[in-house]
């Protein structure tokens, strides 16, 4: 169940999609990727307060137990719920090729 | 790709499956679940150092960008890679029923 999307911590503080610009050097890809030279990496960042975008029953349990035992059980974490594919031009032994990666860019986020 | 399972932080410190004993009251379930009275909740807890159990390309990117921009990009997070089902006996309007939940107990863990 996709629970409440209202962030009690204030606008933009809770789990959501962010875009971080990164070069191939930043990503450690310069030795095997040719293009694009820069990637707009979409990733999930932000807090997961009680029931905010809870991905499933497990996330709800985690919230309850974190409240009881904060030193033992961490709060739910903001992670991708799904991904957008991205195509890279990459070096190969014989030249260059195209490869689509379907687990590279976050599409939307939830707490788990 | 399931990357290295060797924890550089010392035994048991990195992302792995933990079991936390919880009562129905702890979970906030006492008003709708009859049995079991206590649940051995398996959950994913621990640090995600560089490339440890990286779930996918996104996790690898996150590690790289966290190293560069630790205040902006969080480290990967330890979350369930899969779940074990659990059957609950629960109250209904007409009496009791059995219900299987397939997203309640973590089965194994990875970093994302």
């Amino acid at each position: 169940a996709r629970n409440g999307d209202h962030c009690p911590l204030g606008p933009g503080r809770c789990c959501r999609l962010h875009t971080v610009r990164a070069s191939l050097e930043d990503l450690g890809w310069a030795d095997w990727v040719l293009s694009p030279r820069e990637v707009q990496v979409t990733m999930c960042i932000g807090a997961c307060p009680s029931q905010f975008r809870a991905a499933n029953m497990h996330a709800q349990i985690k919230t309850s137990l974190h409240r009881l035992k904060p030193d033992t059980v961490p709060a739910p974490c903001c992670v991708p719920a799904s991904y957008n594919p991205m195509v890279l031009i990459q070096k190969t032994d014989t030249g260059v090729s195209l490869q689509t990666y379907d687990d590279l860019l976050a599409k939307d986020c939830h707490c788990i | 790709a399931r990357n290295g399972d060797h924890c550089p932080l010392g035994p048991g410190r990195c992302c792995r499956l933990h079991t936390v004993r919880a009562s129905l009251e702890d979970l906030g379930w006492a008003d709708w679940v009859l049995s079991p009275r206590e649940v051995q909740v398996t959950m994913c807890i621990g640090a995600c150092p560089s490339q440890f159990r990286a779930a996918n390309m996104h996790a690898q990117i996150k590690t790289s960008l966290h190293r560069l921009k630790p205040d902006t990009v969080p480290a990967p997070c330890c979350v369930p890679a899969s779940y074990n089902p659990m059957v609950l006996i629960q109250k209904t309007d007409t009496g009791v029923s059995l219900q299987t939940y397939d997203d309640l107990l973590a089965k194994d863990c990875h970093c994302i």
Epitope: L34, S35, P36, R37, Q40, N84, P85, M86, V87, L88, I89, V96, S97, L98, Q99, T100, D102, L105 | -
Partner: antibody, heavy 119, light 107 residues
């Protein structure tokens, strides 16, 4: 408006050379790749190859490797498809398409250039 | 190279019908598959990307599903403007390849 405008129809003789063009407008030309697609009369679509206009990296389908050359001039936001020696079997409609590497799809297409090769 | 096999190669249907077109890849391509619609004398138009994502501006009667080797394009209620040829396209890795097309004709 984002669009790709291709050069006009061509009628050529076997053995002649040809260069057709595809001009992008309404977007940053170097932020997307350009692909070329062939459609022979009454037939389906065939992927020919792709170019990254920013680095001029090209990748060809093996079926078209050595048969055509894909190039680009980013200063005028134009991609090209050229033949050094046309054959009658090159008679087809040729489409250029903008490739979004985010999402992996051809989202904007040119109107097509009909190339007829006949003696 | 990855071969893409579409079926049927043609079909006749009436306005309001539910139409299903399938596409099979010769090896797993995850969800790296697009669907295009082409009308006579026109350039192809993107309908679905990443197997199931509806392209902006495309009517919701179009939907895509599948992963791995088997994919489906469904038109829930065929409209007069939907009579066209439909192509699947794999972009898992180069060389990218199209299916041979499915022509949807008026019954």
């Amino acid at each position: 408006e984002v669009q790709l405008v291709q050069s006009g129809a061509e009628v050529k003789k076997p053995g002649e050379s040809l260069k057709i063009s595809c001009k992008g407008s309404g977007y940053s030309f170097t932020d997307y790749w350009i692909s070329w697609v062939r459609q022979m009369p009454g037939k389906g679509l065939e992927w020919m190859g792709i170019i990254d206009p920013s680095g001029s990296y090209t990748i060809y389908s093996p079926s078209f490797q050595g048969q055509v050359t894909i190039s680009a001039d980013k200063s005028i936001s134009t991609a090209y498809l050229q033949w050094s020696s046309l054959k009658a079997s090159d008679t087809a409609m040729y489409y250029c398409a903008r490739v979004s590497y985010y999402g992996g799809y051809f989202d904007i297409w040119g109107q097509g250039t009909l190339v007829t090769v006949s003696s | 190279d990855i071969q893409m096999t579409q079926s049927p190669s043609s079909l006749s249907a009436s306005v309001g019908d539910r139409v299903t077109i399938t596409c099979r890849a010769s090896q797993s391509i995850s969800n790296n598959l697009n669907w295009y619609q082409q009308k006579p004398g026109k350039a192809p138009k993107l309908l679905i990307y990443a197997a199931s994502n509806l392209q902006s501006g495309v009517p919701s009667r179009f939907s895509g599903s599948g992963s791995g080797t088997d994919f489906t394009l469904t038109i829930s209620s065929l409209q007069p403007e939907d009579f066209a040829t439909y192509y699947c396209f794999q972009l898992d890795h180069s060389p990218f390849t199209f299916g041979q097309g499915t022509k949807v004709e008026i019954k």
